[in-house]
């Protein structure tokens, strides 16, 4: 229970302005009224209230909103924002954009990715998709933070807004979350040529299948290092090393610097040995000719075993 | 179903005392706001006094202020009104509501209780 | 403080008329504190409109509120004999809060 004090009548407060920033901690609990301070919330944030105050400030709206502030008062939150935890804003019903507009750019140069994210997600919810507007805000004031949506909430993305994302705002994207994108990108792009085409869904091809990059292999495409290191480890497997090597066309001699990482590494354990051979790059650890290793964890553990001997 | 119950009017000398309670049931009273409003009888409404639920931040009208005490007791769900020195023009009906801070009014009512201030 | 007055006093109008009531205020107030009472005779107030235009629950669409800054309406499309009695607004933007001196709305 909270420690109570009187507030002495000539700290009563009014109206919130400037005065309050000469208020104690003590005075601005019994003084400061919730009511008082959510209907006026659009001034706080013009007030220079120290981090203390803040935090009292905080209290105050958690006692008027048990159950998570509305948006009237979100949209005006401001630095106060910054005292916001996940489960804080996991109560939020968050539909404007303006709201959106304004948290973000206050919690920029701030470590808030858990309380951004979280908002994002509310932002979703409560506009029930994530609308072109949303991922336009997003890409405009949070770049990147496409990423920290979850799968499921990806899954409400219409394909039509696909057109929108850069690729800059996938790069902390993980595989569950391409995985959702990657059928949208693909249906979002179909119409297109095949440079063109390729340039689009490059950005999302974390979440492509094995029979894509096939089809992919077939059309002369040249894809770099850097995008075939984010495929699925699991799409990359089944591939033949010339489906690999038209993949990657003169990117080919790339493989040789990343024979050691994943899903190169992985990918050369499943080839035979003379096929990698056919490359010309000294890629080793392939299936030795004459040798058919049908579980790849044994030959995992295998070449685990002859690394350190 | 939200129930809000006053009592401990009646009639009191002008200077004299009286304690108003409001019972409340059907809601979390821990969590929520409270209020007193008064009406004169013929008269319109006019705010006493409210608190909030945990700090029980108070404030009043300028009518009663350093008159009237409003308190809450969140264990036995109970609103009080700690009315001194009263005066004539005290008195009216002396409502409990709950102020519902999700839409900034007074969503609930009780009946009222009667505060009459004559010699 | 904040001066809430209403206009007109008191309207007289017969059932199934359209009733519009308004409420000035001295000051400007944001519309989210802004609502609206009914009352009739031996009652407590009843809360009708909240944040100057959403309806509490239960209260019937014929009942319906505008307005911001200084000038709020409320409006009762088409009288019910039930609606005649007195109407309040009240702001909680400001301390002290305050009411409205009232509107009767009585059969003609």
């Known amino acids: 229970d909270v420690e109570r004090t009187t507030c002495p009548p000539e700290k009563e407060v009014h109206e919130i302005d400037e005065s309050l920033i000469f208020y104690k901690k003590r005075e601005l609990e019994a003084c400061v009224d919730a009511a008082l301070l959510a209907a006026q919330m659009d001034r706080v944030d013009a007030i220079p209230f120290t981090y203390e105050q803040l935090d009292v400030l905080k209290h105050k709206l958690d006692e008027l909103y048990p159950q998570g502030y509305p948006e009237s008062v979100i949209r005006h939150l401001g630095h106060l924002f910054l005292k916001m935890s996940p489960e804080d804003i996991r109560k939020w019903n968050v539909t404007s954009l303006e709201t959106l507009k304004a948290l973000l750019k206050v919690s920029k140069g701030h470590e808030m990715s858990a309380q951004v994210a979280t908002l994002i997600d509310r932002v979703v919810v409560g506009r029930g998709q994530l609308d072109k507007d949303t991922a336009d805000t997003l890409t405009a004031f949070c770049p990147g933070c496409l990423c920290s949506l979850s799968p499921e909430r990806l899954s409400s993305v219409p394909p039509s807004i696909i057109g929108a994302v850069r690729p800059q705002d996938l790069d902390t994207c993980g595989p569950r979350q391409l995985d959702v994108l990657y059928p949208k990108a693909r249906l979002a792009f179909q119409n297109m040529s095949g440079s063109e085409y390729f340039v689009k869904i490059r950005p999302f091809l974390g979440g492509a299948p094995t029979e894509d990059l096939k089809a992919l292999s077939q059309q002369n495409v040249s894809m770099d290092l850097a995008t075939f290191m984010k495929l699925r480890r699991e799409a990359v497997l089944p591939l033949s090393v010339a489906e690999v090597q038209k993949l990657l066309g003169p990117h080919v001699e790339g493989l040789k610097v990343e024979e050691q990482h994943s899903p190169v590494r992985d990918w050369i354990l499943k080839q035979r040995q003379d096929d990698l051979d056919t490359l010309g790059l000294g890629l080793q650890g392939g299936i030795p000719n004459g040798y058919l290793i049908l579980d790849l964890s044994v030959r995992e553990a295998l070449s685990h075993h002859h690394h350190h001997h | 179903e939200v129930q809000l119950l006053e009592s401990g009017g009646g009639l009191v000398q002008p200077g004299g005392s009286l304690r108003l309670s409001c019972a409340a049931s059907?809601?979390?009273?821990?969590?929520?706001?409270m209020s007193w409003v008064r009406q004169a009888p013929g008269k319109g409404l006019e705010w006493v006094s409210n608190?909030?639920?945990?700090?029980?931040?108070?404030n009043y009208a300028d009518s009663v202020k350093g008159r009237f005490t409003i308190s809450r007791d969140n264990s036995k769900n109970t609103l009080y009104l700690q009315m001194n020195s009263l005066r004539a023009e005290d008195t009216a009906v002396y409502y409990c509501?709950?102020?519902?801070?999700?839409?900034?009014?007074?969503?609930?009512w009780g009946q009222g209780t009667l505060v009459t201030v004559s010699s | 403080e904040i001066v809430l007055t209403q206009s007109p006093g008191t309207l007289s109008l017969s059932p199934g008329e359209r009733a519009t009531l308004s409420c000035r205020a001295s000051q400007s107030v944001s519309s989210s504190y802004l609502a609206w009472y009914q009352q009739k005779p031996g009652q407590a107030p009843r809360l009708l409109i909240y944040g100057a235009s959403s309806r509490a629950t239960g209260i019937p669409d014929r009942f319906s509120g505008s307005g911001s800054g200084t000038d709020f309406t409320l409006t009762i499309s088409r009288l019910e004999p039930e609606d005649f009695a007195v109407y309040y607004c009240q702001q909680s933007y400001y301390y002290p809060i305050t009411f409205g001196q009232g509107t009767k709305v009585e059969i003609k």
């Open positions: 608190i909030s639920p945990t700090y029980s931040t108070t």
């Open positions: 059907g809601f979390t009273f821990t969590n929520t706001y």
């Open positions: 509501a709950r102020y519902n801070s999700y839409q900034g009014g007074l969503d609930y």
